[in-house]
Amino acid sequence: LQDPCSNCPAGTFCDNNRNQICSPCPPNSFSSAGGQRTCDICRQCKGVFRTRKECSSTSNAECDCTPGFHCLGAGCSMCEQDCKQGQELTKKGCKDCCFGTFNDQKRGICRPWTNCSLDGKSVLVNGTKERDVVCGPSPADLSPGASSVTPPAPAREPGHSPQ
């Protein structure tokens, strides 16, 4: 015998209290698949979270973060403070990248400058706190007496935007 609940579409639930008829999900709840016996409570985007997509009867709300913060975790389960380019977030707040490392985003960690010689290349543009080096041709490709290193381009906001 076919389960009568299997006929209940997304946006409804199979109501045991009413002879298993399909009832619409109550306000602030949803069911994203058919045949559900309950509707799920909608996520609420509060505090540092803001609503990216409203809850509907068939899909949950989606949150992102207020300006100055960025999402972490699946489905933006957390918001983390932005830092400036050239910094990383530590337990004590935003700290400048150490020499030889950079961060060209408002999130994430300071990473070591690329080691151009790993690929047999030279450094074309020096790194800064806000920018990685730019690797250039291999030293053998450079004409004798030619300088291989260009000073770094001036750092500018917004640089790599937070994702």
Epitope: T114, V125, H160
Partner: antibody, heavy 119, light 107 residues
């Protein structure tokens, strides 16, 4: 030499998912960013996102945030892009690329993987 | 997102001609501008990076120049094997963005 070899063409039904792979060789996989770029039929190139295989740090184009999941397996030097809830608009050639020695340019490109979404 | 406006969208030129393609960024991207060649078989190759640096092995007829928002890609003497579509791309700010492409044909 540096090479990126992608998985073969895929035909999928709307609503399905697909996982495209990109096997890297000829360099230290963990030291360079892998990018994914989409090209719809007759269209230009669109950057979807990238991953730094050393720590699996990812960046996404907001447009692909709910569509694509980029991962990397260091043990096999392979990067992946999984596309979910496929629609006809996702029909495209997907390329993986490797950076030139900092994230700002893409020096090596895979041969491309054609994903066709059709009922 | 940074918009990259590339022109022309297509052009037809004769072997030996000097060909110029321009790319304009919607905001300052310093020198983080790259040029790619996509052959009819869909293979893609980086030709020029950081505005004007040719990758090793790229013929000297290919060059690039510019800074800030306005950039130029030049083929000094067009060869039959240069039939391709050429794209500019900014690497300054995420998300990376490409120009619409210039399809180059031989007269």
């Amino acid at each position: 030499q540096v090479q990126l070899v992608q998985s073969g063409a895929e035909v999928k039904k709307p609503g399905a998912s697909v996982k495209v792979s990109c096997k890297a060789s000829g360099y230290t996989f963990t030291s360079y960013w892998i990018n994914w770029v989409r090209q719809a039929p007759g269209q230009g190139l669109e950057w979807a996102g990238n991953i730094y295989p050393s720590d699996s740090y990812t960046n996404y184009n907001q447009k692909f945030k709910d569509k694509a999941t980029i991962t990397a397996d260091k043990s096999t030097s392979t990067a992946y892009m999984e596309l979910s809830s496929l629609r006809s608009e996702d029909t495209a050639v997907y390329y993986c690329t490797r950076d030139y020695g900092s994230a700002y340019s893409m020096s090596t490109w895979g041969q491309g993987t054609t994903v066709t979404v059709s009922s | 997102d940074i918009q990259m406006t590339q022109s022309p969208s297509s052009l037809s030129a004769s072997v030996g001609d000097r060909v110029t393609i321009t790319c304009q960024a919607s905001q300052d991207i310093s020198n983080y501008l790259n040029w790619y060649q996509q052959k009819p078989d869909k293979t893609v190759k980086l030709l020029i990076y950081y505005t004007g640096r040719a990758r090793s092995g790229v013929p000297s007829r290919f060059s690039g120049s510019g800074s800030g928002t306005d950039f130029t890609f030049t083929i000094s003497s067009l060869q039959p094997e240069d039939i391709a579509t050429y794209f500019c791309q900014q690497g300054d700010t995420l998300p990376y963005t490409f120009g619409q492409g210039t399809k180059l044909e031989i007269k």
